[in-house]
Interface confidence: medium
């Protein structure tokens, strides 16, 4: 058998920011990012990963939260939440998603 | 939006080189792997080789019938991909497309640049 | 080195029509087939991966089937804006290798 040919990034993924060039793109995985800065509403921005992997081995904080997957437009309907650190009355995952 | 622009296509003789670029937008060019294509008038499309991306190595993969006289660089500062044909034959005319994807998927491709080999 | 057999070279068809483009390989290339479309003067566009994903953002009446040698791109429904070139790729194998190309004309 004839040695398959290598490939770099191959998952289509969801792509949804300020840096997409499209409607999708194509990466080693696709990602979920929710940020939240300060004084600001939180922002989940769906897109694909090349570099960085352990990103997506972090836990959970009340500022980021960043979820990764690896198959076909894995990241579509995926919606995270960041840490509770703030009173009930302030839930900031659930704003902007 | 993705863009792919060919030039530096044109007329050489037999025997002489020519270096083609390929200018890119609308994406991370350094992290992808580019890839040329060629298309011979009347005849179907042929992998002429690859540049996967430095992160990965930036090595290089050709085709048979161009390997030893064809060299795949790139410059990520400049987002452009080269090709630089030496040693130029007849059958080398073709138009030439620059494209990129994994190095295996041609996710977008370029209108083309004309070579015409011929003395 | 695998060699594709596209058919037809050309064919004709008219709105509404269900289209059939066969690919076949030499060799058993698993489902490492992508299927292309290309206008003339325009970049080609990516159509189908992996022999039957569609590739987001294409319409659905484009469907690809197959595995193996023996492969299909169909097009159901046919519209006048789907006359172009088509041709299969496959990545199974260095060299990669392209079919022959279908050319659609829509009457």
């Known amino acids: 058998d004839p040695v398959k040919p290598s490939r770099g990034p191959l998952v289509t993924c969801t792509c949804e920011s300020p840096h997409c060039k499209g409607p999708t793109c194509r990466g080693a995985w696709c990602t979920v990012v929710l940020v939240r800065e300060e004084g600001r509403h939180p922002q989940e921005h769906r897109g694909c990963g090349n570099l960085h992997r352990e990103l997506c081995r972090g836990r959970p904080t009340e500022f980021v939260n960043h979820y990764c997957c690896d198959s076909h437009l894995c990241n579509h309907n995926v919606s995270l939440v960041l840490e509770a650190t703030q009173p009930p009355s302030e839930q900031p995952g659930t704003d902007g998603q | 939006e993705v863009q792919l622009v060919e030039s530096g296509g044109g007329l050489v003789k037999p025997g002489g080189s020519l270096r083609l670029s390929c200018a890119a937008s609308?994406?991370?060019?350094?992290?992808?792997?580019m890839s040329w294509v060629r298309q011979a008038p009347g005849k179907g499309l042929e992998w002429v080789g690859r540049?996967?991306?430095?992160?990965?190595?930036?090595?290089?993969d050709y085709a048979a019938p161009v390997k030893g006289r064809f060299t795949i660089s790139r410059d990520d500062s400049k987002n452009t991909l080269y090709l630089q044909m030496n040693s130029l034959k007849t059958e080398d005319t073709a138009v030439y497309y620059c494209t990129t994807g994994d190095g295996t998927h041609f996710d977008y491709w370029g209108q083309g640049t004309l070579v015409t080999v011929s003395s | 080195e695998t060699t594709l057999t596209q058919s037809p070279a050309f064919m004709s068809a008219t709105p509404g029509d269900k289209v059939n483009i066969s690919c076949k390989a030499s060799q058993d290339i698993d489902d490492d087939m992508n299927w292309y479309q290309q206008k003339p003067g325009e970049a080609a566009i990516f159509i189908i991966q992996?022999?039957?994903t569609l590739v987001p953002g294409i319409p659905p009446r484009f469907s690809g089937s197959g595995y193996g040698t023996d492969f299909t791109l169909t097009i159901n429904n046919i519209e006048s804006e789907d006359a172009a070139y088509y041709f299969c790729?496959?990545?199974?194998?260095?060299?990669?290798?392209f079919g022959g190309g279908t050319k659609v004309e829509i009457k």
């Open positions: 609308g994406f991370t060019f350094s992290n992808a792997w």
């Open positions: 540049i996967k991306s430095k992160t990965d190595g930036g090595t290089t």
């Open positions: 790729l496959q990545h199974d194998n260095f060299p990669l290798t």
């Open positions: 992996e022999a039957t």
